[in-house]
């Protein structure tokens, strides 16, 4: 796949990593996570125009078919290519524990 | 994540595997693939409502933040969870070769 990194829609409009500041209340975790109470959530947001950060040949196919049948086949979508781990301190039956989550924060993004 | 498999939007409306019949011309492969001339492309299409086939905790977060900030954070997106391989017979400089592609046909789907 041709993984173009120049966004034809203008700077920052295409699929890329964004940081969203969120409280535990925002995330729906207030009842089971003790700390941190605020999180910098990294996620993949933005458009996936032709040839932009195509993850694989499936993404290429999807774009070609989307052009032909836009009502049937959606454009590729901006999703995490990999994740960063994160620590949450949570309440357990026996007290308090440090817990690592591997699939929580996007590390980088591509179009699928 | 709670991977609900019942679509609250009605049968077939949520993220699932679809088969799209496509020619090599549709796919943009006519100049380098000899066979097959037509492909049953399996791809992931459909909506990702709350708790439906959430791939991981990131998808859960994304949905919660989408509810709060729909203009900033998009809903999770229906993408392949895994792929089926496919063999293409293609032209090479020296003739013809059988080539296996591992990332071409979606095998199953989830929401990320």
């Amino acid at each position: 796949a041709r993984n173009g990194d120049r966004c034809p829609l203008g700077p920052g409009r295409c699929c890329r990593l964004h940081t969203v500041h969120a409280s535990l209340e925002d995330l729906g975790w207030a009842d089971w996570v003790l700390s941190p109470r605020e999180v910098q959530v990294t996620m993949c947001i933005g458009a996936c125009p032709s040839q932009f950060r195509e993850a694989n040949m499936h993404a290429q196919i999807k774009m070609n078919l989307h052009r032909l049948k836009p009502d049937t086949v959606p454009a590729p979508c901006c999703v995490p290519a990999s994740y960063n781990p994160m620590v949450l301190i949570q309440k357990t039956d026996t007290g308090v524990s440090l817990q690592t989550y591997d699939d929580l924060l996007a590390k980088d993004c591509h179009c699928v | 994540a709670r991977n609900g498999d019942r679509c609250p939007l009605g049968p077939g409306r949520c993220c699932r595997l679809h088969t799209v019949h496509a020619s090599l011309e549709d796919l943009g492969w006519a100049d380098w693939v000899l066979s097959p001339r037509e492909v049953q492309v399996t791809m992931c299409i459909g909506a990702c409502p709350s708790q439906f086939r959430e791939a991981n905790m990131h998808a859960q977060i994304k949905m919660n933040l989408h509810r709060l900030k729909p203009d900033t954070v998009p809903a999770p997106c229906c993408v392949p969870a895994s792929y089926n391989p496919m063999v293409l017979i293609q032209k090479t400089d020296t003739g013809v070769s059988l080539q296996t592609y591992d990332d071409l046909l979606a095998k199953d789907c989830h929401c990320v």
Epitope: L34, P36, V87, G95, S97, L98 | -
Partner: antibody, heavy 119, light 107 residues
């Protein structure tokens, strides 16, 4: 800027108690936990325990269990560490430190409070 | 409890030298290892977190690497202000633990 300011030095007799304070500023106090770490003269760093400013839940080092109590006062953004039944080997500099954050970072430390236990 | 073993316990080096300190954990803690610098009479200062992330404001001559149980702090070109004691620390699980420290002295 983010700051943790601790109370002044203390001299205590064996068997007594000490209560060290740690006042936070420059961030939302309830968003992070506070660790207490001590350092005996010429020695390394020893973690004593952690408290979440949000709910008061704690996790103490096993060797100090029963002798240490950590509390917070959210109205003044202050954390406290009380150590009872003091012994001479409790003589140390006591630090408060914010964290761990989402990347397990203990990023901001107080200036330290010297506690001397001597008869 | 997770034990952290730091080596060497002390190192003599000159300004401009490359200095490497290692930290070995008794079990996997990837990537939750941090490195601190401490000068006499001062509180520890966070240099590196999550094994390799440079804390804001820390000079780029400091770098961290490693995963699993074996981690390294490297000072690429030692500066006069870098003579201090360095500690590794894990926050993979409670209790949080520290390495024994490495004193970097002037040769």
């Amino acid at each position: 800027q983010v700051q943790l300011v601790q109370s002044g030095a203390e001299v205590k007799k064996p068997g007594a108690s000490v209560k060290v304070s740690c006042k936070a500023s420059g961030y939302t106090f309830t968003s992070y936990g506070i660790n207490w770490v001590r350092q005996a003269p010429g020695q390394g760093l020893e973690w004593m325990g952690w408290i979440t400013a949000y709910s008061g839940d704690t996790n103490y080092a096993q060797k100090l269990q029963g002798r240490v109590t950590m509390t917070t006062d959210t109205s003044t953004s202050t954390a406290y560490m009380e150590l009872r039944s003091l012994r001479s080997d409790d003589t140390a500099v006591y630090y408060c430190a914010r964290g761990p954050g989402q990347y397990a970072d203990v990023d901001v430390w107080g200036q330290g409070t010297m506690v001397t236990v001597s008869s | 409890d997770i034990q952290l073993t730091q080596s060497p316990s002390s190192v003599s080096a000159s300004v401009g030298d490359r200095v490497t300190i290692t930290c070995r954990a008794s079990q996997g803690i990837s990537p939750w290892l941090a490195w601190y610098q401490q000068k006499p009479g001062k509180a520890p200062k966070l240099l590196i977190y999550a094994a390799s992330s440079l804390q804001s404001g820390v000079p780029s001559r400091f770098s961290g690497s490693g995963s699993g149980t074996d981690f390294t702090l490297t000072i690429s070109s030692l500066q006069p202000e870098d003579f201090a004691t360095y500690y590794c620390q894990q926050a993979n699980s409670f209790p949080i633990t520290f390495g024994g420290g490495t004193k970097v002295e002037i040769k």
